[in-house]
């Protein structure tokens, strides 16, 4: 018969290194008689036999942690007791080893140039991982602006455009390496004007192109302001290349102005703007105003819209208080007077009246109107509207039509320049050039002049007889 023997732990516990999710085993070999009861503690807390995370075998001498978690690290002790002598204890540490893990990866960042950017990269691992960063395909070098913090985050002071790109963090220890996903650092740049528009001193009615170039990220938009208001006329052409926007504003200069180029881009909810201004002055502007008795502008009325050349500059007479309205009212009144005339006369008379009241502008230091060519005036008077003209003159002689005649802005043909003397001195009426080709029957002309006096309009193929002897002076 064996003698009772107090427990002796023959293989003391050792420090165990274990990887997360792997198995870790502590062995506590005990010699004793009778057989001891063996219990296990972790950090002095009893491990319950029914805890499914553990397996206790060999009469309690083997403790197995079935799937190690990082929270399992600590001091494990086995305690053997068989009632003979005192209980014995042996302890060993579990060191949970962990491949690097990125617990807070970096995210895409938009940052304004000049500010500070921080890309997070929080890691776990045992041994503690070292963190480095890759930009594009290359390892990122630290410098006075760029540093990897103790936490693993990347800090960039005074962000520059060239800092933009794709970044990833790398966590490394003896057990392995972890990579974050690629993230994008976008550097936004406040709108800035690279090339301001230049001031111009030009002749009245010139074309001027104002050019404004701006840069920014995102690419800015450019708008133009004229004397504090949105530009009402002119054409804008834009092109974008390498984050640079080039805007060209082409203007018809009919008055001096201050033109401002405004470059704007958006950063989140905020906008950044940059401005540059240029003046457009008119050479001898005050003299022009005095001499010209008017100004040139595009026709914006309705009555003559279909008659006048599209987008043409016409002359507005400043002897009227509100020239554009006054001239439109005059033509409107004349239009009503024309309702009763023949279908042959009406369009010709409309062409004559519109071009007489809204005369084509000619270039030069001063805005100057170009009168209608005498030939076209006479064609309306003696060919297209012979009857009506006679009737009108007859009424005027009898005093029946004085107010009407005053309202009808009919030119006096004899006081108009001839296109045969100076073709650049007067305006032609294209309607009449076209229409006379299609006249096959003469209106009955009963004016005091013989019918041979109908003027010779430009095309020699006209279908009505004209006399080259007609004196066009």
């Amino acid at each position: 018969e064996k003698l009772p023997k107090a427990p002796v732990i023959t293989t003391p516990l050792e420090t165990v290194d274990a990887l997360v999710e792997e198995v870790a085993t502590f062995m506590c070999a005990v010699e004793s008689y009778p057989q001891p009861e063996i219990s296990w503690t972790r950090n002095k807390i009893l491990i319950k036999l029914f805890d499914t995370r553990y397996s206790i075998r060999e009469n309690g001498q083997l403790l197995t942690i079935l799937s190690v978690e990082d929270s399992d690290d600590g001091i494990y002790c086995c305690i053997a007791n068989n009632g003979v002598g005192g209980a014995v204890e042996s302890c060993g540490a579990l060191q949970v080893k962990m491949k690097p893990k990125i617990t807070r990866p970096p995210i895409n960042v938009k940052i304004i140039e000049g500010l500070k950017a921080v890309l997070p990269c929080t890691t776990m691992g045992n041994p503690k991982p070292s963190v480095s960063w890759i930009k594009g395909d290359n390892a990122l070098r630290e410098n006075s602006r760029i540093a990897v913090l103790e936490s693993g985050s990347l800090r960039i002071h005074n962000v520059q455009k060239e800092d933009a790109g794709q970044y990833r963090c790398v966590a490394k220890n003896s057990l392995g390496t972890a990579y974050s996903k690629l993230v994008k650092l976008e550097v936004e740049v406040f709108a800035r004007i690279l090339r301001a528009p230049e001031s111009h001193n030009v002749t009245f009615g010139s074309f001027v192109t104002l050019r404004c170039t701006a840069i920014g990220i995102p690419v800015p938009t450019i708008s133009w302001i004229e004397n504090g208001n949105a530009v009402s006329s002119g054409s804008i052409q834009e092109s974008v290349k390498d984050r640079v926007i080039d805007s060209r504003l082409q203007l018809f200069i009919t008055k001096p102005g201050l033109y401002t180029c405004i470059a704007t881009n958006k950063h989140g909810e905020k906008f950044s703007t940059a401005k540059a201004a240029a003046t457009v002055s008119i050479a001898e502007w005050s003299k022009s105003q005095k001499d010209s008795q008017g100004y040139c502008a595009q026709y914006r009325g309705e009555v003559c819209d279909a008659v006048l050349a599209k987008d043409a500059l016409v002359f507005f007479n400043t002897s009227y208080r509100d020239p554009e309205d006054a001239q439109e009212l005059l033509i409107h009144t004349a239009w009503n007077e024309l309702k009763a005339v023949s279908p042959l006369c009406r369009p010709a008379a409309e062409a004559l009246l519109c071009n007489h009241l809204f005369q084509e502008c000619s270039p030069g230091v001063v805005p100057t109107p170009m009168p209608i060519c005498r030939e076209y005036c006479l064609a309306v008077k003696e060919l297209f509207c012979a009857k009506e003209w006679q009737a009108m003159e007859g009424k005027a002689h009898r005093g029946l039509y004085r107010s009407g005649m005053h309202l009808l802005p009919v030119p006096e043909c004899s006081k108009l320049p001839s296109m045969h003397r100076d073709p650049t001195a007067c305006t032609r009426l294209p309607y009449l050039d076209y229409k006379k080709e299609n006249i096959t029957t003469f209106p009955s002309i009963t004016s005091s002049r013989p019918s041979a006096d109908i003027p010779n309009l430009p095309a020699s193929t006209s279908s009505f007889a004209v006399s080259p002897a007609y004196s066009m002076t």
Epitope: D311, A312, S362, P363, S414, K415, D422, T424, A425, T473
Partner: antibody, heavy 115, light 111 residues
Framework: EVQLVESGGGLVQPGGSLSLSCVAS????????MNWVRQAPGKGLEWLSV???????YYADSVKGRFTISRDNVKNTLYLQLNNLKPEDTALYYC?????????WGQGTQVTVSS | EIVLTQSPSSVTASAGEKVTINCKSS??????????LAWYQQRPGQSPRLLIY???TRESGVPDRFSGSGSTTDFTLTISSFQPEDVAVYYC?????????FGSGTRLEIK
């Protein structure tokens, strides 16, 4: 037919003066812009001045302050007063009808500035 | 002022040959849908004669072998079939703004 006949040219000493005339016929003179253009011997054309139908005048920088254009619509005559003449003003002086193109030209009158 | 640069300064051509003369303006002469550029011919010992106005409109009486083209700053006078009577100096001129200015001229001679 349009006719422009210049006169008044001649030999003049530097610093001297001369008055050129151009009589127009064959058209209603008052309705048209009139110009003076000159051509130095063997050289190109040089525009000098224009006068519009309201008698408003414009000049080339080379003659501004020395030459004066004027018109008399009753006499159908265009004038050019030449003052403080210089040797480089020696040229054939043309009277020309035309607003923005120079449409009808006279035969010209010769001005020679020499000591 | 607007400077007009004419090229070439002289041309020699045979009868029936096509001749082109160029005129480049230092700034646009386009106003109100018209190009204010004219071409003139000056035969030896004669006054200049208007050939083309508004860049492409032929003056009455000018043979249709003469034509003008171009817009804004670049213009061309073309003689489609050179004739002996076309021997002359040709000038371009802008009527866009005063002072009106001429090109330096192109002398056209016969081979």
């Amino acid at each position: 037919e349009v006719q422009l006949v210049e006169s008044g040219g001649g030999l003049v000493q530097p610093g001297g003066s001369l008055s050129l005339s151009c009589v127009a016929s064959g058209f209603t003179f008052s309705l048209y812009y009139m110009n003076w253009v000159r051509q130095a011997p063997g050289k190109g054309l040089e525009w000098l001045s224009v006068i519009d139908t309201h008698s408003i005048a414009y000049y080339a920088d080379s003659v501004k302050g020395r030459f004066t254009i004027s018109r008399d619509n009753v006499k159908n005559t265009l004038y050019l007063q030449l003052n403080n003449l210089k040797p480089e003003d020696t040229a054939l002086y043309y009277c020309v009808l035309g607003r923005t193109a120079l449409v009808r030209w006279g035969q010209g009158t010769q001005v020679t500035v020499s000591s | 002022e607007i400077v007009l640069t004419q090229s070439p300064s002289s041309v020699t051509a045979s009868a029936g040959e096509k001749v082109t003369i160029n005129c480049k303006s230092s700034q646009s002469v386009l106003y109100n849908q018209k190009n204010y550029l004219a071409w003139y011919q000056q035969r030896p010992g004669q006054s200049p004669r208007l050939l083309i106005y508004w860049a492409s409109t032929r003056e009455s009486g000018v043979p249709d072998r003469f034509s003008g083209s171009g817009s804004t700053t670049d213009f061309t006078l073309t003689i489609s079939s050179f004739q002996p009577e076309d021997v002359a100096v040709y000038y371009c001129q802008q009527g866009y703004s005063v002072p009106y200015t001429f090109g330096s001229g192109t002398r056209l001679e016969i081979k």
